[in-house]
């Protein structure tokens, strides 16, 4: 049910990458405005972003509060300049979104190498421990404070002269790799949590070659 | 559920190349990571070589670079191994195997790979 | 490269009996290391990943533990279904190796 002039929202999609969540659907209003509500499967509705005319609506702010926990939106369509008005039922239209939980379905950001230090034949290659939006005691917490040892990362190296490619894995935040002596080596990083089933990896971080600004070299 | 079907037995003359598929269902192959194991007959297991099917990266033991070559087709979710100049060394059972990155969590069956003049 | 050391390499055990198996890399591997069971004619199945976790659908009779460069897996209770072989495996870093098994047989 609803009013004559409103439409249900539809394709109702979560857009999150480390834990930075948004919640995006169609159709772009005509004579309508958009009031999204989010729950956990057992708390209150809590409104955001009333009466907009965005198919989008920014909900970080609220799943932060504990990424386990099960999400579930609702957006509410209403007539432009008239949304106390209601359906026949007494109700504004509505349409549900999927279920949503966070920790295991935020998608991984690219990474970053931080930098790379070569002390002798020994290289450290270091991730950058990407900031999320999930506080705790008033900080911000990192992706490794918040996933812990659910998180690894995958390095590939190789020669700058050749093609062949090694790989590492860590469950910290730093590699600690055996290279040749006297050769330039590139690196990429990618984020994984094998343990979930859907949005395990993340894309590659960008290339990093020794012999470029960000990595130390020190021969010992 | 989780399956890796294997292509069937070959016998190859040496000097020549094989190629062996692994067909992927009831997972998205560019989710994991793809590996290659073999084992001849009476022996343990050697790692070939894996590949990443979300950005082609392969690695390789040193001991076969430059004779195999590890690729996906992930509108087929198929990884495929190919070893070229073929020994009689190289008779084993060769599998493919799902790493999750934790462990390789599921495998084929085998592909019983015979190089005999 | 890792050097995995696996040992024994055979053992003769009675039903019942515990079981340890042992697995020593040559660098902290960082956890990385899995444990599997193969029957002849059969691919490997894994029983431990990430060192100390039981893969779905093995019995609780098997356990890994250890970190750093020695991992061990343990039999609690010998079954007779477990007479095979064991592999421990590195992927911590390629190339990725297996140690060279460990047959248990009846004694």
């Known amino acids: 049910s609803g009013t004559t002039n409103t439409v249900a929202a539809y394709n109702l999609t979560w857009k999150s990458t480390n834990f930075k969540t948004i919640l995006e659907w169609e159709p772009k209003p005509v004579n309508q405005v958009y009031t999204v509500q989010i729950s956990t499967k057992s708390g209150d509705w809590k409104s955001k972003c009333f009466y907009t005319t965005d198919t989008e609506c920014d909900l970080t702010d609220e799943i932060v509060k504990d990424v386990k926990q099960t999400y579930l939106a609702r957006v509410f369509s209403y007539p432009a300049g008239n949304v106390e008005s209601t359906g026949s039922a007494g109700e504004p239209l509505y349409e549900n979104s999927p279920e949503f939980t966070p920790y295991l379905e935020t998608n991984l950001g690219q990474p970053t190498i931080q930098s790379f230090e070569q002390v002798g034949t020994k290289v450290n290659v270091t991730v950058e421990d990407e900031r999320t939006l999930v506080r705790r005691n008033n900080t911000f917490l990192s992706l490794r404070d918040v996933f812990g040892k659910d998180l690894i990362y995958t390095l590939y190296y190789w020669k700058s002269s050749s093609s062949g490619k090694k790989t590492a894995k860590t469950n910290t935040n730093e590699f600690l790799i055996d290279v040749d002596k006297g050769e330039n080596y590139c690196f990429s990083v990618q984020a994984v949590i094998p343990s979930r089933t859907v949005n395990r990896k993340s894309t590659d971080s960008p290339v990093e070659c020794m012999g470029q600004e960000k990595g130390e070299f020190r021969e010992i | 559920q989780v399956q890796l079907l294997e292509s069937g037995a070959v016998l190859a003359r040496p000097g020549t190349s094989v190629k062996i598929s692994c067909k992927a269902s009831g997972f998205n192959i560019k989710d994991y990571y793809m590996h290659w194991v073999r084992q001849a007959p009476g022996q343990g297991l050697e790692w070939i070589g894996g590949?990443?099917?979300?950005?082609?990266?392969?690695m390789y033991d040193p001991k076969f670079q430059g004779r195999v070559t590890i690729t996906a087709d992930e509108s087929t979710s198929t990884a495929y191994m190919e070893l070229s100049s073929l020994r009689s060394e190289d008779s084993a059972v060769y599998f493919c195997?799902?790493?999750?990155?934790?462990?390789?969590?599921?495998w084929g069956q085998g592909t019983l790979v015979t190089v005999s003049s | 490269d890792i050097q995995m050391t696996q040992s024994p390499s055979s053992l003769s055990a009675s039903v019942g009996d515990r079981v340890t198996i042992t697995c020593k890399a040559s660098q902290d591997i960082k956890s990385f290391l899995s444990w599997y069971q193969q029957k002849p004619g059969k691919a490997p199945k894994l029983l431990i990943y990430?060192?100390?976790s039981l893969a779905d659908g093995v019995p609780s009779r098997f356990s890994g533990s250890g970190s750093g460069t020695d991992y061990t897996l343990t039999i609690s209770s010998l079954q007779p279904e477990d007479f095979a072989t064991y592999y421990c495996l590195q992927h911590g870093e390629s190339p990725y190796t297996f140690g060279g098994g460990t047959k248990v047989e009846i004694k």
């Open positions: 195997a799902r790493d999750s990155g934790y462990a390789m969590d599921y």
């Open positions: 590949n990443d099917p979300a950005n082609g990266h392969s």
């Open positions: 990430y060192a100390t």
